[in-house]
Interface confidence: medium
């Protein structure tokens, strides 16, 4: 999906008001310094691409993020503020239902959510030069 035509300010507002809290709640008890940010993004569409990938695509050691509160709110924000996004997700959602696993918070998931926090921070600061 091409995120170029999303309403970035509306997505940012959704992040600042709710998604950020849910990410903090998920990471509660984990020091942010435990993980190095290895995933980066260069502009807002790129950031949303990376955020979608880390949030919804199962990875080795972390298959369960899509059912977390921050993920559901991220999905809702993208569906509302990115034209045509919902349609592209129908097949992906059906595939996910077939391989649903019980929620387990692993260290790998914590690391992944730490990366997500960094991507969201970058999304919110589009005028900053890339580090």
């Amino acid at each position: 999906y091409d995120f170029t035509n999303c309403d970035f300010e509306k997505i940012k507002a959704a992040y600042l008001s709710t998604i950020s809290k849910d990410l903090i709640t998920y990471m509660s008890g984990t020091k942010s310094t435990e993980f190095n940010n290895t995933v980066s993004c260069s502009n807002r569409p790129h950031c949303l691409t990376e955020i979608q990938s880390l949030t919804f695509n199962p990875t080795a050691g972390c298959a369960s993020l899509a059912k977390e509160m921050f993920a559901m709110k991220t999905k809702a924000a993208l569906a509302i503020w990115c034209p045509g996004y919902s349609e592209t997700q129908i097949n992906a959602t059906q595939a996910m239902k077939k391989r649903r696993k019980r929620k387990v918070t692993t260290n790998k998931c914590l690391e992944q959510v730490s990366q997500l926090q960094g991507l969201w921070r970058r999304f919110n600061r589009p005028l900053l030069k890339q580090q």
Partner: nanobody
Framework: EVQLVESGGGLVQPGGSLRLSCAAS??????????IGWFRQAPGKEREGVSC????????YYADSVKGRFTISRDNSKNTVYLQMNSLRPEDTAVYYC??????????????????WGQGTLVTVSS
């Protein structure tokens, strides 16, 4: 649940002082590299950033309008950030909010991104 609760506001005469507190629950300031800041919104005006403290190195930032009068500090053992406000002026009258997940050094204090999580605390400066 993740929450921020602001307190310490009230009615004070011009030239007086107040200390605002921002207490976090549901998460620990010290565990994150989020910066924490204070904002205010006066009746009929836009929200504006007042001050910010970096959770990485303790660096502090102030809006020009409060420099030399306000001091931001934090106490990680109490999970609280404070705003000491001295030499208060009528134009400081506003609802004061604190917020996390902001970025002290990006665009200047006045241009923070933020969304209030708490109800804020009202500061009224009047004789």
């Amino acid at each position: 649940e993740v929450q921020l609760v602001e307190s310490g506001g009230g009615l004070v005469q011009p030239g007086g002082s107040l200390r605002l507190s921002c207490a976090a629950s549901g998460f620990t300031f010290a565990d994150y590299d989020y910066d924490i800041g204070w904002f205010r919104q006066a009746p009929g005006k836009e929200r504006e950033g007042v001050s910010c403290i970096s959770n990485r190195d303790g660096s502090t930032y102030y809006a020009d309008s409060v420099k030399g009068r306000f001091t931001i500090s934090r106490d990680n053992s109490k999970n609280t950030v404070y705003l000491q406000m001295n030499s208060l002026r009528p134009e400081d009258t506003a609802v004061y909010y604190c917020a996390v997940e902001i970025h002290c050094d990006d665009y200047g204090v006045e241009n923070f991104d933020f969304d209030p999580w708490g109800q804020g605390t009202l500061v009224t400066v009047s004789s």
